[in-house]
């Protein structure tokens, strides 16, 4: 069987629960990015997450080799009816995938959105958002995921994740 | 044009209607897996489904070569809403992607979820769930898809499908 | 670092606003296809869209090299709910991915669907649909995306897109 190992430029990083730094503060460096950046990804959970010729720094995947990458993320929004006055029933759940280059502001690559059920009878909501696409990245570019309504994210490793691989 | 053929490790298998064994019985071997495994995939529908250096057995894709695989599935939930005496049974539609290794229990790789509309005006529901991610698999590992509310799945070949390919 | 460039067969094309020909007329050549074909894709927006060994013609990606392609698209449906007496508020949002071969009619590869919220309280809707899968394509095959309710599509480049890459 041929050896493919050295060819591999890929990552799949997964949500991890219970860290206080799961999401960046609203005024962190990516304040020009919409939503809040997810910081707390796990990259070495056996059989579930890994990094291969990509680095992970501050919730961002850092590119080591230029090329076209298929980049994807899934975020799992979960919430329930709660007695909270002065809150609107509807929630906009948006997942953004950004890149940083030598340009100072983050550049939006993809966005995917859902709004929650408007019915007053709604008891809870489950909404997974997946998106992915191909982008040309250069060495030292960084990619990250941000979301609206970050407190609704289920950061189980199988529910919310972020990944990329070099194509061709 | 260069010959890529021998490099290819890939599969795209599609839903097929009207078989009695579309879904495993609730007490079949994967009872430790959430949901019900989809058994009835078609792998040789010209132009739509294929297997290339992967096998299909009992609804599971069987790995022949170790490496990092992008694994994906789409399941299409479709139903009429039944209003029964002022009750509304919300539906949780969840798609799970599992792997079997030498470890006896299946290991959950990804899950994606949606709940149906709570409004009493709802007459029907259409909900496609797609998810995909990169995972390291070994020879003889097996991957499969299971779902909740399996009776709601539209098993048209273009609507519900399951696939994987070796990356890099 | 090894040179991967010549290996690459890939495209990511993005929505573009404000063109009158964004969607094909209902009676254009693909009348046998469900929905309306999206014509107005952009293929050379720096850092966002590109073509590499694939052509774009009339909204269709034209294959130059046979092989297995991962094909994907995202379409972002966005609308205000209009309150109209005695009318049903529900919308079916379907995304189709088709191919043309030497056979005269388009062949449906994938379809993904959502219906909008039924609630009378609904004020607006945000629904992104993503799907992707692996298909064998031959030289001169063409692939395209069509949608129902095309007037609801947000053609921002980061919201609606279409892409493919050669696997293995």
């Amino acid at each position: 069987v041929r050896e493919r190992g050295p060819q591999r430029v890929a990552a799949h990083i997964t949500g991890t629960r219970g860290r206080s730094n799961t999401l960046s503060s609203p005024n962190s460096k990516n304040e020009k990015a919409l939503g809040r950046k997810i910081n707390s990804w796990e990259s070495s959970r056996s059989g579930h997450s890994f990094l291969s010729n990509l680095h992970l720094r501050n919730g961002e995947l850092v590119i080591q080799e230029k090329g076209f990458y298929y980049i994807y993320s899934q975020t799992y929004f979960r919430f329930q009816e709660e007695i909270k006055e002065n809150t609107k029933n509807d929630k906009q759940m948006v997942q953004y995938i950004y890149k940083y280059t030598s340009y100072p502001d983050p550049i939006l690559l993809m966005k995917s959105a859902r709004n929650s059920c408007w019915s007053k009878d709604a008891e809870y909501g489950l909404y997974s958002i997946y998106q992915g696409g191909l982008f040309e990245l250069k060495k030292d570019d960084r990619i990250f995921v941000s979301v609206t309504n970050e407190h609704l994210i289920d950061m189980d490793h199988e529910a919310s994740f972020f990944g990329a691989f070099l194509v061709g | 044009v260069r010959e890529r053929g021998p490099q290819r490790v890939a599969a795209h298998i599609t839903g097929t209607r009207g078989r009695s064994n579309t879904l495993s019985s609730p007490n079949s071997k994967n009872e430790k897996a959430l949901g019900r495994k989809i058994n009835s995939w078609e792998s040789s529908r010209s132009g739509h489904s294929f297997l290339s250096n992967l096998h299909l057995r009992n609804g599971e894709l069987v790995i022949q070569e170790k490496g990092f695989y992008y694994i994906y599935s789409q399941t299409y939930f479709r139903f009429q809403e039944e209003i029964k005496e002022n009750t509304k049974n919300d539906k949780q539609m969840v798609q799970y992607i599992y792997k079997y290794t030498s470890y006896p229990d299946p290991i959950l790789l990804m899950k994606s979820a949606r709940n149906s509309c709570w409004s009493k005006d709802a007459e029907y529901g259409l909900y496609s769930i797609y998810q995909g991610g990169l995972f390291e698999l070994k020879k003889d590992d097996r991957i499969f898809v299971s779902v909740t509310n399996e009776h709601l799945i539209d098993m048209d070949h273009e609507a519900s499908f399951f696939g994987a390919f070796l990356v890099g | 670092v090894r040179e991967r460039g010549p290996q690459r067969v890939a495209a990511h094309i993005t929505g573009t606003r404000g063109r009158s020909n964004t969607l094909s007329s209902p009676n254009s050549k693909n009348e046998k296809a469900l929905g309306r074909k999206i014509n107005s894709w952009e293929s050379s927006r720096s850092g966002h869209s590109f073509l590499s060994n694939l052509h774009l013609r009339n909204g269709e990606l034209v294959i130059q090299e046979k092989g297995f392609y991962y094909i994907y698209s995202q379409t972002y449906f966005r609308f205000q709910e209009e309150i109209k007496e005695n009318t049903k508020n529900d919308k079916q949002m379907v995304q189709y991915i088709y191919k043309y071969t030497s056979y005269p009619d388009p062949i449906l590869l994938m379809k993904s669907a959502r219906n909008s919220c039924w609630s009378k309280d609904a004020e607006y809707g945000l629904y992104s649909i993503y799907q992707g899968g692996l298909f064998e394509l031959k030289k001169d095959d063409r692939i395209f995306v069509s949608v129902t309710n095309e007037h609801l599509i947000d053609m921002d480049h980061e919201a609606s897109f279409f892409g493919a890459f050669l696997v293995g």
Partner: antibody, heavy 115, light 107 residues
């Protein structure tokens, strides 16, 4: 502060009827689903009924359908449970809870079915 | 119906000890599980919802976690106020169901 206060419990003969009330305060009552739960003398908790905020939907376990009816009067911020054809096994402490995920509980009202 | 199997049914422990209670769901409940505490006077209070979210005002020694269909309530260091009955509740679907309860007693 959310407050739920149950009333209407007491001693009733088998086959008899009883109507429980739950007075709610501290939140916009009409926006939220409400439930009744009972606790048997053996300390087992059993869900009895749920009603949606607008009253459109009502839910019961199969074994209580037809005998128990949940209702609400949003103008009065009050939840009700009408119980009929009572049996000895309906003897329990009855609690109201809000909303449908049961974030808040009342202090309970005791129902004894005995001849 | 979704069956919640709660264990143990009773537990004797000492002040300062760490204890864990478990609830296993027979079907997927998507994390829609809460833990309730009932004091001897009959008062019921929710401690945790959505499997792991602490209710406001609940001491941080209480925590909830999930592994697949197994849900746990952990008290990191028992205090005298914690000796009570504990129940799990699933609110993912109807009928709502409760675990059988755990009586936590002082050793």
């Amino acid at each position: 502060e959310v407050m739920l206060v149950e009333s209407g419990g007491g001693l009733v003969q088998p086959g008899g009827s009883l109507k429980l009330s739950c007075a709610a305060s501290g939140f916009t009552f009409s926006n939220y689903g409400m439930s009744w739960v009972r606790q048997t003398p053996e300390k087992r908790l059993e869900w009895v009924a749920t009603i949606s905020g607008g009253g459109s939907y009502t839910y019961y376990p199969d074994n209580l359908k037809g005998r128990f009816t949940i209702s609400r009067e949003n103008a009065k911020n009050t939840l009700y449970l009408q119980m009929s054809s009572l049996r000895s096994e309906d003897t329990a402490m009855y609690y109201c809870a809000a909303p449908t995920a049961m974030d808040y509980w009342g202090q309970g009202t005791s129902v004894t079915v005995s001849s | 119906d979704i069956l919640l199997t709660q264990s143990p049914s009773s537990l004797s422990a000492s002040l300062g000890e760490r204890v864990s209670l478990t609830c296993r769901a027979s079907q997927e409940i998507s994390g829609f599980l809460s833990w309730l505490q009932q004091k001897p006077d009959g008062t019921i209070k929710r401690l945790i919802y959505a499997a792991s979210t602490l209710d406001s005002g609940v001491p941080k020694r209480f925590s909830g976690s999930r592994s697949g269909s197994d849900y746990s309530l952990t008290i990191s260091s028992l205090e005298s106020d914690d000796f009570a009955d504990y129940y799990c509740l699933q609110y993912a679907s109807y009928p709502r169901t409760f675990g059988g309860g755990t009586k936590l007693e002082i050793k």
